[in-house]
């Protein structure tokens, strides 16, 4: 009885198509594959940036598999064949792995690439980025920003640069269509006639990193004798209200009263009838319902009640 | 449908170089290994190289490696081969071809005529 | 290097019948083997691969067999299009070579 052996498939190798770090793994089928025609092969892939305690697994019968890295590091993956237990009346059989590894040869020392990037969604409307120059490099030093997510044809370079002596430090990005709960890549490069300038690359989602504008149209309600109404409309802009978390930070006579996260445009207050002065302000971050992080907003304007009985009246700003 | 476009004729003498181009079409080009394959006059196919859908591997018989450079510009979808130090058994035409995923050549490019002659 | 040898080297054949073409590889190849069809003047097209596998757009009366050493390209009832060269190759191993060709005549 022959044991059935399976080669490792063929020319495995990882493509960069210019997306940033969006990069395709890609391999040919093993040597004689068609020994196997009614049997579906499949393929076991494993890859991980380098410095990565742990392997992504994929099982798959293609012979492509596209996902986003850190160009920041190198790449390495290995693949293997798989024969599923159908195929060789008995148990499943592997072949040997075929392994590939990839970088982007880095240019210059780390010290010249970009410091400190900031990159801030603000209202769900307009990205901006932001960075300060590499440690000790020139004034003839520039920086150029590139970007790309699915959806764009290919990488684009920002078009609308924040300067400062002459330096590009920020991008103001245009419009970007279908751009959020996708992996959004930048890579910001530099050119210098004096020494070479290492580039950096970034990847987030848009979602998670809005800043909405504050709460507007604050108001006092009274409710009860001890009771007041807080209320505050959603901010102006494309964010829907379910997309809120808020913080209330409320003083009563000078006196930080209370400070509370709500997810409802409205918060009672328990009061006493010796008050003679209430402010409030609040601020909105997106919730967890409609991204994993965000920016809190600015505070609001503060909204306050003082001289006189409240019972007797509903303020409005 | 799958179309490679081959340029035109090169006339060169001994000792020089020329780079040949083919133009693809119909298929996602990154995604297949393509070849050189070259027929001297009244003669048969002689495998000339090789290259990878993303470009990492080359593959050169003997005859032409140190000489021959395949390379592609996934970008354009384009495919390319500089021949260097060109003797006159180096005349045939020279066809590209995209390697199937058994590495067999499912299409073929139209020619292109290399005269290596003083 | 892998020899691949083909013949005969020239196959005068009546149209209707059938003709087969042997290809014998110098070391084992597996099943890795292709056939083309290089009409006069044209470039080559692919017929065959696997050794048995027809590509698409192939006319059924073409058909391959063998595995190791010994290939066979049989076509069951010749029509005047087929003349040309045949050619095997095989992939086991690079470096990629062909047979030297059999050329299909009609008597």
């Known amino acids: 009885d022959t044991e059935i052996k399976v080669n490792p498939p063929q020319d495995f190798e990882i493509v960069d198509p210019g997306y940033l770090g969006y990069l395709y793994l890609q391999w040919q089928p093993p040597l004689s594959l068609d020994h196997f025609k009614e049997c579906t092969v499949e393929y076991e892939l494993k890859y991980r940036n380098i410095g990565s305690e742990t392997w992504k697994t994929i099982i798959t019968k293609n012979l492509h598999y596209k996902d986003g890295f850190d160009l920041n590091k190198g790449i390495e993956a290995k693949i293997h064949t798989l024969l599923p237990w159908q195929c060789t009346n008995g148990s499943e059989v592997q072949s040997s792995w075929a392994e590939t590894t990839y970088w982007i040869s880095p240019q210059g020392i780390p010290e010249t690439k970009v410091q400190d990037m900031d990159c801030v969604y603000y209202n769900w409307q307009y990205l901006l980025c932001s960075w300060k120059p590499g440690i000790g490099v020139l004034l003839d030093t520039n920086y150029n920003l590139f970007y790309w997510y699915e959806g764009l044809d290919h990488a684009l370079q920002c078009v609308d640069y924040i300067k400062a002596d002459g330096q590009n430090i920020g991008c103001r990005f245009p419009y970007l269509e279908a751009s959020d709960y996708k992996d959004f890549y930048i890579c910001v490069n530099g050119s210098s006639e004096n020494k070479p300038i290492r580039s950096s690359y970034f990847t987030f989602q848009l979602q998670n990193i809005v800043k909405p504008l504050p709460p507007v149209y604050l108001t006092f309600t009274r409710e009860s004798s001890c009771e007041i109404k807080l209320k505050w409309s959603i901010p102006l802009g494309p964010i829907p209200a379910r997309c809120f978390d808020y913080e209330i930070e409320i003083r009563e006579d000078d006196t930080t009263l209370v400070t509370a996260t709500v997810e409802n445009e409205t918060y009672t207050l328990k009061t006493t009838n010796e008050t003679r002065q209430l402010c409030f302000v609040v601020r909105s971050k997106v919730n967890i319902y409609c991204s994993d992080d965000g920016i809190w907003s600015e505070w609001s304007d503060k909204q306050c009640w003082e001289g006189e009985d409240l019972s007797k009246k509903t303020l409005l700003r | 449908q799958v179309q490679l476009v081959q340029s035109g004729a090169e006339v060169v003498k001994p000792g020089a170089s020329v780079k040949l181009s083919c133009k693809a079409s119909?298929?996602?080009?990154?995604?297949?290994?393509m070849s050189w394959v070259r027929q001297a006059p009244g003669q048969g196919l002689e495998w000339v190289a090789t290259?990878?859908?993303?470009?990492?591997?080359?593959y050169y018989p003997e005859s032409v490696k140190g000489r021959f450079t395949i390379t592609r510009d996934n970008s354009t979808s384009t495919l390319y081969m500089e021949m260097r130090s060109l003797r006159s058994d180096d005349t045939a035409v020279y066809y590209c071809?995209?390697?199937?995923?058994?590495?067999?050549?499912?299409?073929w490019g139209q020619g292109t005529l290399v005269t290596v002659s003083s | 290097d892998i020899v691949m040898t083909q013949s005969p080297l020239s196959l005068p054949t009546t149209l209707g019948q059938p003709a087969s073409i042997s290809c014998k590889a110098s070391?084992?190849?597996?099943?890795?083997v292709a056939w083309y069809q290089q009409r006069p003047g044209q470039s080559p097209r692919a017929l065959i691969y696997?050794?048995?596998y027809r590509y698409s757009g192939v006319p059924d009366r073409f058909s391959g067999s063998g595995s190791g050493t010994d290939f066979t390209l049989t076509i069951s009832r010749v029509e005047a299009e087929d003349v040309g060269v045949f050619y095997c190759?095989?992939?086991?191993?690079?470096?990629?070579?062909f047979g030297g060709g059999t050329k299909l005549e009609i008597k």
């Open positions: 071809a995209r390697r199937d995923l058994r590495s067999a050549m499912d299409y």
């Open positions: 119909g298929f996602t080009f990154s995604s297949y290994g």
């Open positions: 290259i990878s859908g993303g470009g990492s591997y080359t």
């Open positions: 070391q084992n190849v597996d099943i890795n």
């Open positions: 696997s050794a048995s």
């Open positions: 190759q095989q992939y086991n191993a690079y470096p990629l070579t």
